[in-house]
């Protein structure tokens, strides 16, 4: 039995649970998902039994090997998978455990602006980047373009301080998860701040 294998898949995609064995006479191979039987294979008997009929079209064995390919992945396929290789030549079954994380392809992140102030010709605010559907394991970074050197900022909140008269800047939020990334619409500092330009000491949401 090897260490737990961590696998990552995307909704609608496929993942292969790698499995090899040099056992000559394999009596059966049993795959389970969160303790529920998924597939039972009898290589010598030539039979493959998929416990739930709806999974039949999703199960495959690349190149006729022992590895299990699961396609048309859904979010709720995330969980613990376990395989046991049973053979009369083994004193106890050979086992392997896998943890599968299924992630959605990220949609365009949404940007909201916090309280804005404009003091002494400097526009100060925060931009917050978030996913509308609360997707998991999302990492946010900000790209600030337009100054002499382009800058990056980690985290969902970007503090902005932009002085009127400086060259315009563009802010873009990048949202990433283990299977995809997406970009917010670009935000121009001048446009962002012009709402507060008329009143040098104003604050707005």
């Amino acid at each position: 039995s090897g260490p737990v294998k961590e696998l990552v898949g995307s909704v609608g995609g496929a993942v292969t649970f790698p499995l090899k064995s040099k056992v000559k006479q394999v009596d059966s191979i049993v795959w389970t998902f969160n303790t529920t039987p998924l597939v039972t294979i009898q290589p010598e008997g030539g039979t493959i039994i998929v416990t739930q009929n709806r999974n039949r079209e999703r199960v495959d064995f690349p190149d006729g090997g022992y590895s299990l390919k699961l396609s048309k992945l859904k979010k709720n396929d995330s969980g613990i998978y376990y395989v046991g290789i049973y053979s009369s030549s083994l004193q106890q079954p050979s086992t392997q455990e896998y943890v599968l994380h299924v992630y959605e392809h990220l949609s365009k992140p949404k940007v909201t602006m916090g309280l804005q102030s404009n003091k002494n010709g400097t526009c100060v605010t925060n931009l917050t980047c978030c996913m509308e559907h609360g997707e998991e394991d999302v990492i946010y970074t900000w790209k600030a373009l337009g100054q002499a050197a382009n800058e990056s900022h980690n985290g969902s909140i970007l503090p902005i301080s932009w002085r009127w008269g400086e060259s315009d800047m563009t802010f873009i939020c990048v949202a990433r998860n283990p299977v995809s990334r997406n970009f917010s619409s670009p935000i121009l500092a001048r446009k962002l701040c012009e709402g507060a330009a008329d009143d040098p000491d104003s604050s707005m949401v």
Epitope: P43, E44, G45, G46, T47, D63
Partner: antibody, heavy 120, light 108 residues
């Protein structure tokens, strides 16, 4: 990639023996069953038997016991089939074919075939 | 030994047609049936194993179904390159494995 390369055509006399070879590459030769299949001209397929190169274990179709002898050499990844006491009914194309792991009776890679002609 | 019977030795079809080839086992072989394609002058090629599992790289127009004693191999939309002989084979439990007599698919 998996390849099975068989020896060339044989023309043999009745009563003689012949040994044909099948050299495997691109996979773990020792841990997959190797099958042999006969096809007479214009006819169907007949399973002769199989060998597990890892330990030399063999399984034969009863019809070919005493006719075919299967062996394997792990060091050269080569399987052999010897056919003895040949008669005209042994004239055929003989294929070696690897078993899949998931269903050991299904054969996924085949050699190009070796033609054996028995004639005086 | 288990006898595999393919009732049609020849089948004629047109490009784009759907065609089904049947195979009957003389006793219950569960789902342990494979289908092979053999083109003239070539080695057989595995298409389907365990009755309905398409081998890697095989186009999805080829499908297999059945269990027990009755099995069907279907080409959903025949292509010119599908001209070949198709064999069923039982790979159930203890050998010997046995093949059907083959069905030659001819294109009209």
């Amino acid at each position: 990639q998996v390849q099975l390369q068989q020896s060339g055509p044989e023309l043999v006399k009745p009563g003689a023996s012949v040994k044909i070879s099948c050299k495997a590459s691109g996979y773990a030769f020792s841990s997959s069953w190797m099958n042999w299949v006969k096809q007479r001209p214009g006819q169907g397929l007949e399973w002769i038997g199989r060998i597990y190169p890892g330990d030399g274990d063999t399984k034969y179709n009863g019809k070919f016991k005493g006719k075919a002898t299967l062996t394997a050499d792990k060091s050269s990844s080569t399987a052999y089939m010897q056919l003895s006491s040949l008669t005209s009914v042994d004239s055929a194309v003989y294929f070696c074919a690897r078993s899949t792991m998931i269903a050991t009776g299904a054969m996924d890679y085949w050699g190009q075939g070796t033609s054996v002609t028995v004639s005086s | 030994d288990i006898v595999m019977t393919q009732s049609h030795k020849f089948m004629s079809t047109s490009v784009g047609d759907r065609v089904s080839i049947t195979c009957k086992a003389s006793q219950d072989v569960s789902t342990a049936v494979a289908w092979y394609q053999q083109k003239p002058g070539q080695s057989p090629k595995l298409l389907i194993y365990s009755a309905s599992y398409r081998y890697t790289g095989v186009p999805d127009r080829f499908t297999g179904s059945g269990s027990g004693t009755d099995f069907t191999f279907t080409i959903s939309s025949v292509q010119a390159e599908d001209l070949a002989v198709y064999y069923c084979q039982q790979h159930y439990s203890t050998p010997p494995y046995t093949f059907g007599g083959g069905t030659k698919l001819e294109i009209k």
